[in-house]
């Protein structure tokens, strides 16, 4: 069960995944953009769930990539209320939580579109949730790219 809150999504600025000042950091859009920007190399490995990082990346580049991703994942805790914060979790598990949260948001959005009452009190839709289908697909693809035995832990 996961859902996003908040107002209009703002693209993350730069590899640090820092969101622009003054903007709410609750939209699922930022989560996906952040993951996408930091996982460009990983998302290229669509050759199968067991595929590793492309050989064209040397060890230093991989380290930089993983460092940036760690920063991104720590930011996710502020955006995704389903992420456990009191225990260590693997990146694979984090991605699964993000996917699950977006799924909850989508379920809520779909229910609201049928009844016309977001949140149950005639509330306006506050986030660009209609784009979640594509974002879920992107997240799923990225999750499949991360090796199943990836046990790099994020605090």
């Amino acid at each position: 069960m996961k859902v996003a809150s908040g107002s209009t999504a703002t693209a993350a600025a730069g590899p640090s995944c820092a969101l622009k000042a003054g903007k709410t950091a609750s939209g699922a859009g930022e989560v996906v953009r952040c993951l996408s920007e930091q996982s460009v190399a990983i998302s290229r490995c669509a050759g199968g769930a067991g595929a590793r990082l492309p050989a064209l990346l040397d060890e230093q580049q991989v380290n930089v990539l993983l460092y940036d991703m760690n920063g991104c994942y720590s930011r996710l805790k502020e955006l995704v209320p389903t992420l456990p914060q009191n225990r260590k979790v693997s990146k694979v598990e984090i991605l699964q939580h993000v996917i699950d949260y977006i799924r909850d948001l989508q379920l809520e959005l779909n229910s609201e579109s049928e009844v016309g009452t977001p949140g149950g009190r005639g509330l306006p839709v506050r986030a660009p949730l209609s784009t979640l289908n594509g974002e879920i697909s992107a997240l799923t693809a990225e999750a499949a790219c991360v090796p199943a035995d990836d046990r790099i832990l994020c605090r």
Epitope: S5, T82, Q85, G120
Partner: antibody, heavy 116, light 109 residues
């Protein structure tokens, strides 16, 4: 809307099942929680059921309280080994992922009185 | 389970005044906190979620702030209708924490 039913006067030790009936949405689209409030006291979280049907309980409620989905629009709260301390109004509430899982829609509550 | 400590238990203020309610979590819940208002004989009403985001339809006189373990609900320009009991609640779904604070009764004179 959300509505609770099944509250009544029972003797200590008697099991009791409360039902939460929702309309206008499906239980598979929103997380649903149970909260209780003893007379003149504060709110006490009991447990929650996720959209996938997984259940999570407050530590004190584990083992004695069970949340289960009985249809797309009804869920039960089964309570066993009731004591006078369980006397309270029991609320069913709908969570919203878009509100960071806060409870946005509450039923009016159903009163459970445990007395000998 | 996490423990949510709410203070004060009761507070009295005049119409037009300001009331501040504090909520302390026994461990960090980042921004996963909600505030509710409850009047006698009624179920609670959501005021603020994600620690500081105002629920639609709630007057901007209500303001939530804080993160980690320390949170605050401030009600300014008090109106008679604000007289109620206010509760904080952890909404940490990731760790299955949904504990409520003990509540604060606000009396408006």
């Amino acid at each position: 809307s959300v509505e609770e039913s099944g509250g009544r006067l029972v003797s200590p030790g008697t099991p009791l099942t409360l039902t939460c009936t929702v309309s206008g949405f499906s239980l598979s689209s929103f997380p649903m929680g149970w909260v209780r409030q003893a007379p003149g006291k504060g709110l006490e979280y009991i447990g929650i059921m996720s959209t996938s049907g997984s259940t999570y309980y407050a530590d004190w409620a584990k083992g004695r309280f069970t949340i289960s989905k009985t249809s797309s629009t009804t869920m039960d709260l089964k309570m066993t080994s009731l004591t006078t301390e369980d006397t309270a109004t029991y609320f069913c509430a709908r969570g919203a992922a878009s509100r960071f899982y806060a409870f946005t829609l509450w039923g009016p509550g159903t009163l459970v009185t445990v007395s000998s | 389970d996490i423990v949510m400590t709410q203070t004060p238990a009761s507070v009295e203020a005049a119409v037009g005044g300001t009331v501040t309610i504090k909520c302390q979590a026994s461990e960090s819940i980042i921004n996963r906190l909600a505030w509710y208002q409850q009047k006698p004989g009624q179920p609670p009403k959501l005021l603020i979620y994600r620690a500081s985001t105002l629920e639609s339809g709630v007057p901007s006189r209500f303001k939530g702030s804080g993160s980690g373990t320390e949170f605050t609900l401030t009600i300014s320009d008090l109106e008679c209708d604000d007289g109620a009991t206010y509760y904080c609640q952890a909404t940490d779904y990731g760790d299955s924490y949904f504990t409520f604070g003990g509540g604060t009764e606000v009396v408006v004179k």
